[in-house]
Amino acid sequence: QPDAINAPVTCCYNFTNRKISVQRLASYRRITSSKCPKEAVIFKTIVAKEICADPKQKWVQDSMDHLDKQTQTPKT
């Protein structure tokens, strides 16, 4: 059994300074661990690249809204 207590924590230390088109984004996950220096969003692009972004920025919030809405639409 993996030791969850010692599981590695992913943190973001720098944020992208470029707005990413929502068409390029596939998913996101939030970094909320108190072990990380910054609250962050990690976007995964359609080519599986992970990008750290600042959740305080409006484009980041709008992108999360867009991706959330996609989860309620059945994939065909």
Epitope: Y28, R30, M64, D68, K69
Partner: nanobody
């Protein structure tokens, strides 16, 4: 971490109205999808309503659609649930939740929860 505190619950007669509030403190409120859930005695917790970060999209369970309205004020770090035409079946503890992870109405995608406020609708 986000702290959520609900208020506005109480006892009301069928057909009456209540407005629930949920005040958030801690991390950036506008970066969370916000939802209301409820749990009646001996029943499972159920989704009631959600609002996107921008406030531009709302979504409701079929049981409350047309009667309840969710809104948010990002400047005040508060989300509201206006409940009209209340029915005895609406009796439950109402919980406010902040959704950090990608998703929609699934409780598992909401990371932070308030302690709940009791709403009792008498016939």
């Amino acid at each position: 971490e986000v702290q959520l505190v609900e208020s506005g619950g109480g006892l009301v007669q069928a057909g009456g109205s209540l407005r629930l509030s949920c005040a958030a403190s801690g991390r950036t409120f506008s970066s969370y999808r916000m939802g209301w859930f409820r749990q009646a005695p001996e029943k499972e917790r159920e989704f009631v309503a959600l609002i996107t970060r921008s406030g531009g999209t709302t979504f409701y369970s079929n049981s409350v659609k047309g009667r309840f309205t969710i809104s948010r004020d990002n400047a005040k770090n508060t989300v509201y649930l206006q409940m009209n035409s209340l029915e005895p079946e609406d009796t439950a503890v109402y919980y406010c939740a902040a959704g950090a992870q990608m998703g929609w109405a699934e409780a598992s995608t909401y990371d932070y929860w308030g302690q709940g406020t009791q709403v009792t609708v008498s016939s």
